[in-house]
């Protein structure tokens, strides 16, 4: 009898431990992706950034997928999404085509099932980068809490991609799951 | 028999309650540190800010340590780190040496074991603050998700520290643990 | 005996499942509120924004309340609060009253028990929006980790509300609970 009880108890403990571990670890996907500057498109209009690192330096990913320039959600949930985008120009890089710049970021969500793309967050500034200064810099930060479904994709669009700061501490985006959908 | 079973059950319940409480409370260190403006250094380039409040007003800390101007990690995990830095100048504060300012923040991680310092996040802007305006203001916000190990230290570096806004709602940084390292 | 043990075990499992579900779901209130531009006040001084969506598009709320333009906390805890505020002006909207603008956001906490209002976070920038440009844009992002008590209210104040960008991806604020108060 007593041996049987202990076995039952062990089963309770064991199954609970599994459940606790599983719910804790699996319920918390995350990603922090840093810019891959070897493949930044040119131009000044809105451009989708498709080259990001996911496994070097500060970049990392777990229970999410990075594919074709997009961060793919594998698990339904509410996520905190964020992006930090830095732009810079030094006079040694040559003259800007225009001193009046629109430096913007758009964090977009694409649903495969219903082929559509929507902007979740945007930020930025119009800037006057005069030739009187040898160096110009500007950073944008956006963040917000969103419901994401498995299969949905997050991507980043920016204006003036040629001005992006290629450092991993400068231009990055990410997500982490905060809670399940009820 | 029945009494013994109830004792076993109580033990299961008790140990689980302990485990649940422990994992919930201990697994979530956090800090929100606000600037201590009584001791702001001078300089223009990267200057480390070492004076922060951790226990007054909005400032608070739990399961992390603040020492020698650095936020010390006591528990391995993935943390969301953030900083908000405000710069301001009023004509009554005196005359700036230059109108062309580089207002920047760098959130750095130092590892004691391998004595090295790395920038996790940076943000800011170059600004033209002319004497023709009586007041100037600019804020930077950065945030990101990082793996931190026990013993690692987070610190804040800024340019132009003499221009920092000393309010607790203006200049602060913080961290909170989101999940364990698998 | 054995039947009784199984009943006890089921009770352990059941109560634990309830506890796990309850602590997980109830312990995580959140809100993401987007600007309701049909009712934006005018003026250039600090104005409280009272019209926000909570149940359309990206806007959502759970275990918190939105009432009288304020986000009301229903559950004690430590929350991450954030706001993203975009300002914009196009020459087709007419001339600005002044080219020198102070574009600011203040995230405030009001306690009903002790009738007082305090600013938790502020951000923004002074801007020179010259008539030489046809379009101007600027975004502010702030975020931080705060202890909130049931009944406390979070609200948003901005300067120059007539310049707010009315898009749901542009002007929003939110909160999500990270952990209990010990």
């Amino acid at each position: 009898g007593s041996q049987h009880i202990r076995a039952e108890k062990a089963m309770v403990d064991g199954s609970w431990l599994d459940l606790a571990k599983r719910s804790k670890l699996e319920a918390q996907p995350f990603a922090h992706l840093t810019i891959n500057a070897t493949d930044i498109p040119s131009g000044s209009h809105k451009v989708s950034l498709s080259s990001w690192y996911h496994d070097r330096g500060w970049a990392k990913i777990s229970n999410m997928t990075f594919s074709n320039g997009k961060l793919i959600v594998n698990q339904d949930g509410f996520y905190y999404l964020y992006a930090n985008i830095c732009f810079r120009h030094h006079e040694t890089s040559g003259d800007l085509a225009t001193e009046y710049l629109q430096l913007m970021v758009y964090v977009t969500k694409t649903s495969i099932k219903i082929p559509s793309s929507h902007t979740l967050m945007k930020g930025g500034s119009t800037k006057y980068w005069s030739g009187n200064s040898e160096f110009h810099f500007y950073s944008i930060n956006v963040g917000g809490f969103f419901k994401l479904r498995s299969g949905e994709e997050i991507s980043i669009e920016v204006s003036n991609p040629s001005l992006l700061d290629p450092d991993q501490d400068a231009t990055y985006f990410g997500a982490f799951k905060v809670r399940d959908i009820d | 028999g029945s009494q013994h079973i109830r004792a076993e059950k109580a033990m299961v319940d008790g140990s689980w309650l302990d485990l649940a409480k422990r994992s919930k409370l201990e697994a979530q260190p956090f800090a929100h540190l606000t600037i201590n403006a009584t001791d702001i250094p001078s300089g223009s380039h990267k200057v480390s800010l070492s004076s922060w409040y951790h226990d007054r007003g909005w400032a608070k800390i739990s399961n992390m340590t603040f020492s020698n101007g650095k936020l010390i990690v006591n528990q391995d995990g993935f943390y969301y780190l953030y900083a908000n830095i405000c710069f301001r100048h009023h004509e009554t504060s005196g005359d700036l040496a230059t109108e062309y300012l580089q207002l920047m923040v760098y959130v750095t991680k130092t590892s004691i074991k391998i004595p090295s310092s790395h920038t996790l996040m940076k943000g800011g802007s170059t600004k033209y603050w002319s004497g023709n305006s009586e007041f100037h203001f600019y804020s930077i916000n950065v945030g990101g998700f990082f793996k931190l190990r026990s013993g690692e230290e987070i610190s804040i570096e800024v340019s132009n520290p003499s221009l920092l806004d000393p309010d607790q709602d203006a200049t602060y940084f913080g961290a909170f643990k989101v999940r364990d390292i698998d | 005996g054995s039947q009784h043990i199984r009943a006890e075990k089921a009770m352990v499992d059941g109560s634990w499942l309830d506890l796990a579900k309850r602590s997980k779901l109830e312990a995580q209130p959140f809100a993401h509120l987007t600007i309701n531009a049909t009712d934006i006040p005018s003026g250039s001084h600090k104005v409280s924004l009272s019209s926000w969506y909570h149940d359309r598009g990206w806007a959502k709320i759970s275990n918190m309340t939105f009432s009288n333009g304020k986000l009301i906390v229903n559950q004690d805890g430590f929350y991450y609060l954030y706001a993203n505020i975009c300002f914009r002006h196009h020459e087709t909207s007419g001339d600005l009253a002044t080219e020198y603008l102070q574009l600011m956001v203040y995230v405030t906490k009001t306690s009903i028990k002790i009738p007082s209002s305090h600013t938790l976070m502020k951000g923004g920038s002074t801007k020179y929006w010259s008539g030489n440009s046809e379009f101007h844009f600027y975004s502010i992002n702030v975020g931080g980790f705060f202890k909130l008590r049931s009944g406390e209210e979070i609200s948003i104040e901005v300067s120059n509300p007539s310049l707010l960008d009315p898009d749901q991806d542009a002007t929003y604020f939110g909160a999500f609970k990270v952990r209990d108060i010990d």
């Epitope: - | 001078s42 300089g43 005359d95 700036l96 040496a97 230059t98 109108e99 033209y128 132009n160 | -």
Partner: nanobody, 127 residues
């Protein structure tokens, strides 16, 4: 290497005026904060006035406030010090100085903050 050359000094009666000039060459003058110092015989070098990179901020030591005006012409790479209502105690050698990496407030400046110096020009105020 930046060269600074002062001119415009001379002798004047109390209450008179002088305009000092400092011409810069060999550097990016439009990125320097500029200042004027003076040294009277047997005394320490004294900070007189300074001007910001863009010329929109100026600083004056109390003893010259309201009498001296500092200005600059970045196109001509020149900084000026207009001295009115001169007094005998203004007698000194006046030096022009440039700071290539300006920061903070002009009021906090000391001689050690300046990277480049001119040779000086003599100003004598006596009746």
């Amino acid at each position: 290497e930046v060269q600074l050359v002062e001119s415009g000094g001379g002798s004047v009666q109390p209450g008179g005026s002088l305009r000092l000039s400092c011409a810069a060459s060999g550097g990016t003058f439009s990125r320097y904060a500029m200042g004027w110092f003076r040294q009277a015989p047997g005394k320490e070098r004294e900070f007189v006035s300074a001007i910001s990179v863009g010329g929109t901020y100026q600083y004056y030591v109390d003893s010259v406030k309201g009498r001296f005006t500092i200005s600059r012409d970045n196109a001509e790479s020149t900084v000026y010090l207009q001295m009115n209502s001169l007094k005998p105690e203004d007698t000194a050698v006046y030096y022009c100085a440039g700071d290539a990496s300006p920061y903070g407030y002009l009021r906090e400046y000391t001689a050690t903050r300046f990277d480049y110096w001119g040779q000086g020009t003599q100003v004598t105020v006596s009746s």
